[in-house]
């Protein structure tokens, strides 16, 4: 002799975020005669998901016809399934009693697990350039996950780097979790080509991994190296001085030639050479009229990369080097002529 | 059409047992939900319980818990109900009876009853 | 559980005469759930209206039935030779299922 039970025969589901949930109960008997309802979670609190007999309850369909003589499967459907359906439902049989229903016996539960995919990891740098040498962090975030098992890899041009940490929040049970990662990077002289990557893997990616991406271009500022020659040229009273900036990154520079210390000339990078590494060169020149100038020149060459401090390089222009031509030139002008970069 | 048939009178003694049947015809037996109703001489009726022979599942009313045992053969057709430990006051005459339909709550069907003498 | 009390308990009437007898409920009832039997001496109980206020199959139609609630009423317009009986109401609104005690019609 036996009295009705309540079947649940799933003790846990996984269902996609989007997708529906079929959620199975069967009862043994039909009596006690009375209504079935669906609950989320067990106690005073429960959530009402489905009631056989009243409410509207506009994502849930039964499974079979509640009305068919003798129907004793009271397995529901849920569409449209979000994280925030996570949790255990049970199926409740109720008898009918006066003036309300009496909860009879419950299913032992069935645990909804909504897999839902992360969102795109967003990888951010420094907020200032670094240079060279330098150690810089790099954080990436992915958010809506679930379950809370993921993976998160960080690599440099496809070599993978180790020194990280990771946070998945909330500690505890949610409907969705979020992972937050910082990184720290060396950088070096040739990364301006170079890629940060965050690379997250998720039961819901199906081994396809979510990769997020930051372009070192964005946080390496490599100085320029300075070098000031002189050559000479068919006029025998000129000279030309010129000044390689090598290997710079990014591309704003201004440039300042100093006679003396005194401003000459100041110019703005404009049509660079690019290196294989990504960083530039320029080159700029003066025609220094040697007859007039009575003293050996400094001429300097100094050079502000992308709002930093200026560096600079002197070179000494000896004008005893050059006696045919004191005194030889009597006419005014500029002891400087300007030159155009080449 | 459908007929309930309850078996004959019965007279035990006190602390006897007794096994009463109602065998059920003109219907699927196992697919309606048959029920005891108890009535002692000139009084009114007290419902005992009730069993689905489908899945030969009881509930009773508490009153009767320990005292009633129902069962049901399906290959017979046929419902019993048990009674223990017999006393006078169990001495009543019994009637089986059937829904008219699952949710439809009255007794639309009747057997004929039994008549229980519980006597030394 | 839910009691039911019918009144009166007995009553004689002439026939061709109305008659009303009621069943109070100790918990409201839905009126689907309410229902009348007719028992006459030595025999099984015989439905009557069910839900209320719906004649069963045979039954004539002088008998009706109304009510909501927890109160409720039968009523047999002209009383006939015939409808000397027991009548009971009976809940299907909650376990137990329950009886009233009965009203005993006797015709004069």
């Known amino acids: 002799e036996e009295e009705l039970q309540v079947i649940q025969p799933d003790k846990s589901i996984s269902v996609a975020a989007g997708e529906s949930a079929t959620l199975h109960c069967t009862v043994t008997s039909l009596i006690p005669v009375g209504p079935i309802q669906w609950f989320r979670g067990a106690g005073p609190g429960r959530e009402l998901i489905y009631n056989q007999k009243e409410g509207h309850f506009p994502r849930v369909t039964t499974v079979s016809d509640l009305t068919k003589r003798n129907n004793m499967d009271f397995s529901i459907r849920i569409s449209n399934i979000t994280p925030a359906d996570a949790g255990t439902y049970y199926c409740v049989k109720f008898r009918k009693g006066s003036p309300d229903h009496v909860e009879f016996k419950s299913g032992a539960g069935t645990e909804l697990s909504v897999r839902a995919k992360p969102s795109a990891p967003v990888v951010s740098g420094p907020a200032a350039r670094a240079t060279p040498q330098h150690t810089v962090s790099f954080t990436c975030e992915s958010h809506g996950f679930s379950p809370r098992d993921i993976t998160l890899k960080w690599f440099k041009n496809g070599n993978e780097l180790s020194d990280f940490q990771t946070n998945v929040d909330p500690a505890g049970d949610s409907v969705s979790y979020s992972i937050h990662s910082t990184a720290k990077v060396v950088l070096t002289r040739e990364d301006v080509h170079s890629q940060v990557i965050c690379e997250v893997a998720h039961v819901t990616l199906q081994g396809d991994p979510l990769r997020g991406t930051a372009n070192l271009s964005e946080t390496i500022r490599v100085p320029p190296t300075l070098e000031v020659t002189q050559q000479p040229v068919r006029a025998e009273n000129q000279v030309n001085v010129t000044c390689q900036v090598r290997k710079f990154y990014p591309q704003r520079l201004q440039l300042t030639w100093l006679e003396n210390g005194n401003v000459s000339r100041t110019e703005t990078a404009s049509t660079l050479t690019e290196n294989k590494d990504g960083t530039y060169n320029w080159m700029s020149w003066l025609l220094v009229n040697v007859s007039a100038h009575r003293d050996d020149v400094k001429l300097t060459c100094q050079v502000e990369h992308d709002g930093q401090p200026a560096v600079s390089k002197s070179h000494d222009l000896k004008v005893s080097a050059h006696p045919k031509e004191q005194g030889s030139n009597t006419a005014p002008g500029p002891a400087l002529a300007s030159a155009a970069p080449l | 059409q459908v007929q309930l048939q309850q078996s004959g009178p019965e007279l035990v003694k006190p602390g006897a047992s007794v096994k009463m049947s109602c065998k059920a015809s003109?219907?699927?037996?196992?697919?309606?939900?048959l029920s005891w109703v108890k009535q002692r001489t000139g009084q009114g009726l007290e419902w005992i319980g009730e069993?689905?022979?489908?899945?030969?599942?009881?509930y009773y009313n508490e009153k009767f818990k320990g005292k009633a045992t129902l069962t049901a053969d399906k290959s017979s057709n046929t419902a019993y109900i048990q009674l223990t430990s017999l006393t006078s006051e169990d001495s009543a005459v019994y009637f089986c009876?059937?829904?008219?339909?699952?949710?439809?709550?009255?007794?639309?069907?009747w057997g004929q009853g039994t008549l229980l003498t519980v006597s030394a | 559980e839910n009691v039911l009390t019918q009144s009166p308990e007995k009553m004689a009437v002439s026939l061709g005469q109305k008659v009303t007898m009621t069943c109070s409920a100790s918990?409201?009832?839905?009126?689907?759930?309410l229902h009348w039997y007719q028992q006459k001496s030595g025999a099984s109980p015989k439905p009557l209206i069910h839900?209320?206020?719906n004649l069963a199959s045979g039954v004539p139609a002088r008998f009706s039935g109304s009510g909501s609630g927890t109160s409720y009423s039968l009523t047999i317009s002209s009383v006939e030779a015939e409808d000397a009986a027991t009548y009971y109401c009976?809940?299907?609104?909650?376990?137990?299922?329950?009886f009233g005690g009965g009203t005993n019609l006797e015709i004069k």
């Open positions: 009876g059937r829904f008219y339909d699952y949710d439809g709550g009255w007794f639309a069907y």
């Open positions: 069993i689905y022979p489908g899945t030969i599942t009881t």
């Open positions: 839900g209320t206020s």
């Open positions: 918990s409201s009832v839905s009126s689907s759930d």
């Open positions: 009976q809940q299907w609104s909650g376990y137990p299922w329950t």
């Open positions: 003109g219907y699927t037996f196992s697919e309606y939900v």
